[in-house]
């Protein structure tokens, strides 16, 4: 008796975070024996879509011409071979940006900060939101969530960083979101360049979360410290 069919691989091109109106292609790769591919979307009737395999039959394409709110969500795919259906793929989370107006990102007291000092990145939205995300460009673990407790709506979130080291320097953007769908994000804020001076011999910050020892400085997750004053927001790592 053969074991279960291996699970397919599911991915999105050009990526899984897509601006409203832009195209995205979801690919499901199985085996050469695949006869049919099926894509399921969480909380939607199954199957969400079916496609015949593209030659040489080991993958299928699911096309989304223009990203809208309807497409944001969690997907899994399967393939059917002569012996039956495969295991489900690992999930793919498709996130749409542009659902809400862009927040404003600023640095207090200044985006030019001396190593060893403190800086707070402030993400402010025009309308109350309950989730704020800070993203650092070219970081392997770029997302830091601040999510309000008990559904309280906030106009801003503070991301304190102390002590600042060279690792913190770089380009940041923030997004805001509502808790009812973390697959829908605002337009990105304008970029903020955080410049750390006097940091040639800075020690690495001690992480507050375990990180792979293979990670280099740019792979380090953001390490804000301290409380989040008066915000009612709770920190979540992604």
């Amino acid at each position: 008796q053969a074991g279960p069919l291996p699970k397919p691989t599911l991915w999105a091109e050009p990526g899984s975070v897509i601006s409203w109106g832009n195209s995205v292609t979801i690919w499901c790769q199985g085996t050469l024996e695949a006869r049919e591919y099926r894509l399921d979307k969480e909380e939607s009737p199954a199957p969400w879509d079916r496609q015949n395999p593209l030659e040489p039959k080991n993958k299928a394409r699911f096309s989304i011409p223009s990203m809208t709110e309807d497409y944001a969500g969690r997907y899994r795919c399967y393939y059917r071979s002569p012996v039956g259906w495969s295991q489900p793929s690992d999930p793919l989370e498709l996130v749409m940006t542009g659902a809400y107006s862009k927040p404003t990102l600023s640095a207090l007291p200044s985006p030019l900060v001396t190593s060893g000092k403190s800086v707070t990145l402030l993400c402010q939205s025009r309308s109350p939101m309950d989730t704020f995300l800070l993203i650092k460009e070219r970081a392997a673990h770029p997302l830091l969530h601040l999510r309000s407790e008990h559904g309280a709506q906030q106009h801003q979130a503070e991301f304190p960083m102390s002590p600042v080291t060279s690792v913190h320097g770089g380009t940041y953007r923030c997004f805001s979101s509502h808790g009812f769908s973390h697959y829908l994000l605002s337009h990105p804020s304008d970029p903020l360049e955080l410049i750390v001076s006097g940091s040639l011999e800075d020690p690495r910050p001690s992480p507050t979360r375990s990180v792979s020892t293979a990670a280099g400085p740019e792979d380090q997750p953001l390490m804000p410290t301290g409380s989040v004053p008066h915000s009612g927001l709770r920190r979540h790592w992604e």
Epitope: W20, G21, S23, W48, P65, S66, T68
Partner: antibody
Framework: QVQLQESGPGLVNPSKTLSLTCTVS????????WSWIRQPPGKGLEWIGY???????NYNPSLKSRVTISVDTSKNHFSLKLSSVTAADTAVYYC?????????????????WGQGTTVTVSS | DIQMTQSPSSLSASVGDRVTITCRAS??????LAWYQQKPGKIPKLLIS???TLQSGVPSRFSGSGSGTDFTLTISSLQPEDVATYYC?????????FGQGTKVEIK
């Protein structure tokens, strides 16, 4: 059977604003992209822009500074405004529908078109 | 912006001939391509979307192929009623640009 009908003045003075409306009958505006396309006499098709049911828009960069597309879901219609018109804006103007979500049939192309309305820019 | 280039701009063929129209995108557009037929004095009609998916009611002599940058519309056996101008159009990310059109006539 969904039908689209363009309406608006057939003659517009130069430098004025062209205003057209497309009325959607026999179906919903929801989950579709609604486009305006034009065709100058004897020439090809030119995409002007689209609006989604949420009100989000995208425009042809060559016309963006002069174009506004809006939607009124309660009246089941969407509209085009093109400002500062010249003789080069003389054309047949079409409204058209493109599916916005799986299951809406067209899978990407514009599957329903209005009959078109001729707009002449002249004094 | 991505440009769409059709060739030829016009062609003349006999009834029963196999006719091929090509459309080239200046950058890859996956399979986000539609083909339209516009008969003289009429409105455009969607023939094919997703590069190769035939719309319901379109005769099977029409077919589409291609992905990425190079696409083809084929009429396997040209009929008198196929006299029209054919347009390709990209519909991935805006702008949804049309090709300049290919006019098909009967010899």
């Amino acid at each position: 059977q969904v039908q689209l009908q363009e309406s608006g003045p057939g003659l517009v003075n130069p430098s004025k604003t062209l205003s057209l409306t497309c009325t959607v009958s026999g179906g919903s505006i929801s989950r579709y992209f609604w486009s305006w396309i034009r065709q100058p006499p004897g020439k090809g098709l030119e995409w002007i822009g689209y609006i989604y049911d949420s009100g989000s828009t995208n425009y042809n960069p060559s016309l963006k500074s002069r174009v506004t597309i809006s939607v009124d879901t309660s009246k089941n219609h969407f509209s085009l405004k093109l400002s500062s018109v010249t003789a080069a804006d003389t054309a047949v103007y079409y409204c058209a529908r493109r599916g916005g979500y799986y299951g809406s049939g067209s899978y990407g192309g514009m599957d329903v078109w209005g009959q078109g309305t001729t707009v002449t820019v002249s004094s | 912006d991505i440009q769409m280039t059709q060739s030829p701009s016009s062609l003349s063929a006999s009834v029963g001939d196999r006719v091929t129209i090509t459309c080239r995108a200046s950058q890859g557009i996956s399979n986000y391509l539609a083909w339209y037929q516009q008969k003289p004095g009429k409105i455009p009609k969607l023939l094919i979307s997703a590069a190769s998916t035939l719309q319901s009611g379109v005769p099977s002599r029409f077919s589409g192929s291609g992905s990425g940058t190079d696409f083809t519309l084929t009429i396997s056996s040209l009929q008198p009623e196929d006299v029209a101008t054919y347009y390709c159009q990209k519909y991935d990310s805006a702008p949804w640009t049309f090709g300049q059109g290919t006019k098909v006539e009967i010899k």
